[in-house]
């Protein structure tokens, strides 16, 4: 019978937003199949996505466990079973991944301005607080639940009729600031973990909202 | 080369059970993935049922519900048990264990057969 080797895997790469996290890797497999392990660093290696023709796996169920914990996994490459190979009595391939550790490094999805509302000379906008696959007691926690004051919101304002930007910060999910009567603004927020010095530091800035559309209410 | 021993087929009834089992000549290293195979009179080689060192299985479709697959690693043994036995569940069953390699055995007769 023939001996069809298997070969490893490469790039292996993590994939993760707001704790969902996938790892990714290549080839796309001909007679062969993969199966990933996860595993911290202290503990045993546990199978996922087993017996899988996929180049990715979620292992958002695992690492959701401990998001402080530091991650490794590996993904091992079988023979397909219809291969029909003998040879010898050899481990199969595998390549480790990166180490991960999900709290330093998920990347912080783009936020949504959930709504802002005018009183007179000041304006409330609310950010709305994303949830996560993390549970505590069997409750999913949001991302600020998990991040606490490590996770700041940036927002960006400016007039309706002009470019300069303002910025405001907040260590909550609500800012107040003061605009001119009269006038309408924009909004944009952005996520940032300023103790975070990498390039997931920041998130995408999220949808512009103007005042005098649906989400704003105005009262005098 | 490792050497993989089947035992436990035979004919049974329909709706019956029979309980397959398989010895590795060697140890078999926890990363291994085993399993079994069958092929029907006049068809390829199909995958049944497949487990890890840690016990995750994957199941073909048309098993699943029907057979469970385990496994003892201190016996470097897989074990298939077979419940609800169909006529077209009649094959030869080849356990194997894959490593870098694939390693088979040279497989038990199963009959479903009234």
């Known amino acids: 019978s023939g001996t069809t080797n298997t070969v490893a895997a490469y790039n292996l790469t993590w994939k993760s937003t707001n704790f969902k996290t996938i790892l990714e890797w290549e080839p796309k497999p001909i007679n062969q199949v993969y199966t990933v392990q996860i595993s911290t660093k202290s503990g045993d290696w546990k199978s996922k996505c087993f017996y899988t023709a996929d180049t990715e796996c979620d292992l958002t169920d695992e690492i959701v466990k401990d998001v402080k914990q530091t991650y490794l996994a590996r993904v091992f490459s079988y023979p397909a079973g219809h291969v029909e190979s003998t040879g010898s009595t050899e481990e199969p391939p595998y390549e480790n991944s990166p180490e991960f550790t999900p709290y330093l490094e998920t990347n912080l999805g783009q936020p949504t301005i959930q709504s802002f509302e005018q009183v007179g000379t000041k304006v409330n906008v609310t950010v709305q607080d994303e949830w996560t696959l993390v549970r505590r007691n069997d409750t999913f926690l949001s991302l600020r639940d998990v991040f606490g004051k490590d996770l700041i919101y940036t927002l960006y304002y400016w007039k309706s009729s002009s470019s300069g930007k303002k910025t405001a910060k907040t260590n909550t999910n609500e800012f107040l600031i003061d605009v001119d009567k009269g006038e309408n603004y924009c909004f944009s927020v952005q996520a940032v973990i300023p103790s975070r010095r990498t390039a997931n530091r920041k998130s995408t800035d999220s949808p512009v909202e103007c005042m005098g559309h649906e989400k704003g209410e105005s009262r005098e | 080369q490792v050497q993989l021993v089947e035992s436990g087929g035979g004919l049974v009834q329909p709706g019956g059970s029979l309980r397959l089992s398989c010895t590795a000549s060697?140890?078999?290293?926890?990363?291994?993935?085993m399993g079994w195979h069958r092929q029907a009179p006049g068809k390829g080689l199909e995958l049944v049922a497949v487990i890890s060192g840690d016990g995750v299985t994957h199941y073909a479709d048309f098993v699943k519900g029907r057979f469970t697959i385990s496994r003892d690693n201190a016996k470097n043994a897989v074990y298939l048990q077979m419940n609800f036995l169909r006529a077209e569940d009649t094959a030869v069953y080849y356990c194997?264990?894959?490593?870098?390699?694939?390693?088979w055995g040279q497989g038990t007769m199963v009959t479903v057969s009234s």
């Open positions: 194997y264990a894959a490593g870098r390699w694939n390693h």
């Open positions: 060697e140890t078999i290293s926890s990363t291994y993935i």
